[in-house]
Interface confidence: low
């Protein structure tokens, strides 16, 4: 008769690699007497004999997973016990291998030049797939702008025109390679003027051709403005080549003028615009003009960057040693004063101050600043900032401010031109036009000074909705 013998596992479990949907088998060969009872665990949890995903054969020595799933990854142990000595155990890992699979493929993208583009490419697979990208027919190389993120997505900083094209992502591991569909990255470019029209000083009755060249994606359209209005005379010739539009305006000169070329293109629902201006002066006229007290230039400060119209020409007063910095310093100081005002007042006051310190400029023969329209100034003073304005004037009267209103570079509304007299002689504040549409009621406002000198000024108690002085359409 055989002597009892404690179980010994003669074939320890090993790591098993298996592909998803394939069969995986663990073998646990045991020598013992009497025959042992063999149980199996996965991650220390007992595998039930009746679980149909498994097949246990050869007296429990063979465990087969009939169709491997992702979630079957783990540590499998066989435990053999026959009552003689202790139970013995052997463990091995199941590594579920998976060919690469792209779970979130890239999609077509339209992006504006200079912005950041992200093309997604989320993958699955074991070993973890490496993700690379192909542009056109070539592997895409990473650089300071272009990077493949940990997630597999492609990130392009400061997108350039040359980034446009067809892209696909490639997921690769030792078991295979997966390709996404080709997707298109379209780069849209804001309208930009490549060649601005040149200014001319000509004799009366001359012909002048002003040329303006612009680029953009989509190709911009070019329109011409004469002294703020659509060009009334002259002929325009246009040609388009390689996304560049060339427009030539031929004029018969009988009066001086400021001619502005406006290039516009559309990005979704939004438009981008670039402007360039040139003056046409008549030789005899310019002799009598006085010396300019300032110059027109693009605003390149920071404080009013979000308030002033993009690329607008503003007036810099050359009575300051360094006009740009002097005016920027003034507005910076004013900005700090505005920190304490109400949320209703602040943006209106910012719009007023920025447009007052950096007035729209007509280059012309003599650069001319365009003041804010009186009605807009009054709207800020008597509506948006009524309380603040009154408090400020009260402190000035009581001598609390050495120079009263001059602490803030605030215009004197009564001295500004009215838009009702000449709508082209003054500047509107678009912010107030926008707010006006969204305002229904306001508290009554008491005017802080007599209104006799201001045409159309409302009676001392007024509501925004009915006051003709605030009509801004």
């Amino acid at each position: 008769e055989k002597l009892p013998k404690a179980p010994v596992i003669t074939t320890p479990l090993e790591t098993v690699d298996a592909l998803v949907e394939e069969v995986a088998t663990f073998m646990c060969a045991v020598e013992s007497y009497p025959q042992p009872e063999i149980s199996w665990t996965r991650n220390k949890i007992l595998i039930k004999l009746f679980d149909t995903r498994y097949s246990i054969r050869e007296n429990g020595q063979l465990l087969t997973i009939l169709s491997v799933e992702d979630s079957d990854d783990g540590i499998y142990c066989c435990i053999a016990n026959n009552g003689v000595g202790g139970a013995v155990e052997s463990c091995g890992a199941l590594q579920v291998k998976m060919k690469p699979k792209i779970t979130r493929p890239p999609i077509n993208v339209k992006i504006i030049e200079g912005l950041k583009a992200v093309l997604p490419c989320t993958t699955m697979g074991n070993p973890k797939p490496s993700v690379s990208w192909i542009k056109g027919d070539n592997a895409l190389r990473e650089n300071s702008r272009i990077a493949v993120l940990e997630s597999g997505s492609l990130r392009i900083h400061n997108v350039q025109k040359e980034d446009a094209g067809q892209y696909r992502c490639v997921a690769k591991n030792s078991l295979g390679t997966a390709y996404s569909k080709l997707v298109k990255l379209e780069v849209e470019v804001f309208a930009r003027i490549l060649r601005a029209p040149e200014s001319h000083n000509v004799t009366f009755g001359s012909f002048v051709t002003l040329r303006c060249t612009a680029i953009g994606i989509p190709v911009p359209t070019i329109s011409w403005i004469e002294n703020g209005n659509a060009v009334s005379s002259g002929s325009i010739q246009e040609s388009v080549k390689d996304r560049v539009i060339d427009s030539r305006l031929q004029l018969f000169i009988t009066k001086p003028g400021l001619y502005t070329c406006i290039a516009t293109n559309k990005h979704g629902e939004k438009f981008s615009t670039a402007k360039a201006a040139a003056t046409v002066s008549i030789a005899e006229w310019s002799k009598s003009q006085k010396d300019s007290q300032g110059y027109c230039a693009q605003y390149r400060g920071e404080v009013c960057d979000a308030v002033l119209a993009k690329d607008a020409l503003v007036f810099f007063n050359t009575s300051y040693r360094d006009p740009e910095d002097a005016q920027e310093l003034l507005i910076h100081t004013a900005w700090n004063e505005l920190k304490a005002v109400s949320p209703l007042c602040r943006p209106a006051a910012e719009a007023l101050l920025c447009n007052h310190l950096f007035q729209e400029c007509s280059p012309g023969v003599v650069p001319t600043p365009m003041p804010i329209c009186r009605e807009y100034c009054l709207a800020v003073k008597e509506l948006f900032c009524a309380k603040e304005w009154q408090a400020m004037e009260g402190k000035a009267h009581r001598g609390l401010y050495r120079s009263g209103m001059h602490l803030l570079p605030v215009p004197e509304c009564s001295k500004l031109p009215s838009m009702h007299r000449d709508p082209t002689a003054c500047t509107r504040l678009p912010y107030l036009d926008y707010k006006k549409e969204n305002i229904t009621t306001f508290p009554s406002i008491t005017s802080s000074r007599p209104s006799a000198d201001i045409p159309n000024l409302p009676a001392s108690t007024s509501s925004f909705a009915v006051s003709p002085a605030y009509s801004m359409t």
């Epitope: 400061n158 490549l194 601005a196 693009q298 390149r300 920071e302 740009e324 310093l329």
Partner: antibody
Framework: ELQLVESGGGLVQPGGSLRLSCAAS????????MSWVRQAPGKGLEWVSA????????YYKESVKGRFTISRDNAKKTLYLQMNSLKSEDTAVYYC??????????????WGQGTLVTVSS | QAVVTQEPSLSVSPGGTVTLTCGLS?????????PDWYQQTPGQAPRTLIY???SRHSGVPSRFSGSISGNKAALTITGAQPEDEADYYC????????????FGGGTKLTVL
């Protein structure tokens, strides 16, 4: 006397990093925009980066964008340029320069003596 | 990307007048480019001469003047001196985005 003194240059391998500093004295540092300008051996001047008086925005030459970072510590009167992923073409004398006013793009009206950065393996 | 162009070299006799120009490969230089001019002698840091087209920096002799002529910025030295022999760089403000402030390649001025 207005002074700008650069430091932090040296020899570094491609892909390495350096941090340049520019100590300012003799003027109200936080009232001026500042810039870094470089000059490769035997070559011309090349604007690299700019920052306004308040550090509220930063500007970079296209080829250094994403690799270089300009910053300033107004309390310490110091301008910095953190340079990462250095390339051989970044080899140059780096000048710290003061702008003529608060904005980032006033003229450069005062210059340091420069610090040499050599990127080589 | 616009390139700022300058004459590689120019020469002038002592006491003579010379004009250095600064152009754009595409388009004209305008006052909105705020042309600045810098002088550099060998082994020295640059020195500011002219800023914003025609403003002379403090301490710069009156023989240096700046202007915009035609479609270029210009630096004129009237009554050149031997110490004016140097490299001269112009720089233009190019607006928002990248490469906002761009230097020209420089002009080597020889005072013969």
């Amino acid at each position: 006397e207005l002074q700008l003194v650069e430091s932090g240059g040296g020899l570094v391998q491609p892909g390495g990093s350096l941090r340049l500093s520019c100590a300012a004295s003799g003027f109200t540092f936080d009232d001026y925009g500042m810039s870094w300008v470089r000059q490769a051996p035997g070559k011309g001047l090349e604007w690299v980066s700019a920052i306004p008086w308040n550090g509220g925005s930063t500007y970079y030459k296209e080829s250094v964008k994403g690799r270089f970072t300009i910053s300033r510590d107004n309390a310490k009167k110091t301008l910095y340029l953190q340079m990462n992923s250095l390339k051989s073409e970044d080899t140059a004398v780096y000048y710290c320069a003061k702008r003529s006013g608060r904005i980032a793009f006033g003229a450069l009206d005062a210059w340091g003596q420069g610090t040499l950065v050599t990127v080589s393996s | 990307q616009a390139v700022v162009t300058q004459e590689p070299s120019l020469s002038v006799s002592p006491g003579g007048t010379v004009t250095l120009t600064c152009g754009l490969s595409s388009g004209s230089v305008t006052s909105s480019n705020y042309p600045d001019w810098y002088q550099q002698t060998p082994g020295q840091a640059p020195r500011t001469l002219i800023y914003t087209t025609n403003s002379r920096h403090s301490g710069v002799p009156s023989r240096f003047s700046g202007s915009i002529s035609g479609n270029k910025a210009a630096l004129t030295i009237t009554g050149a001196q031997p110490e004016d022999e140097a490299d001269y760089y112009c720089a233009l403000y190019m607006g928002g985005g990248s490469n906002v402030y761009v230097f020209g390649g420089g002009t080597k001025l020889t005072v013969l």
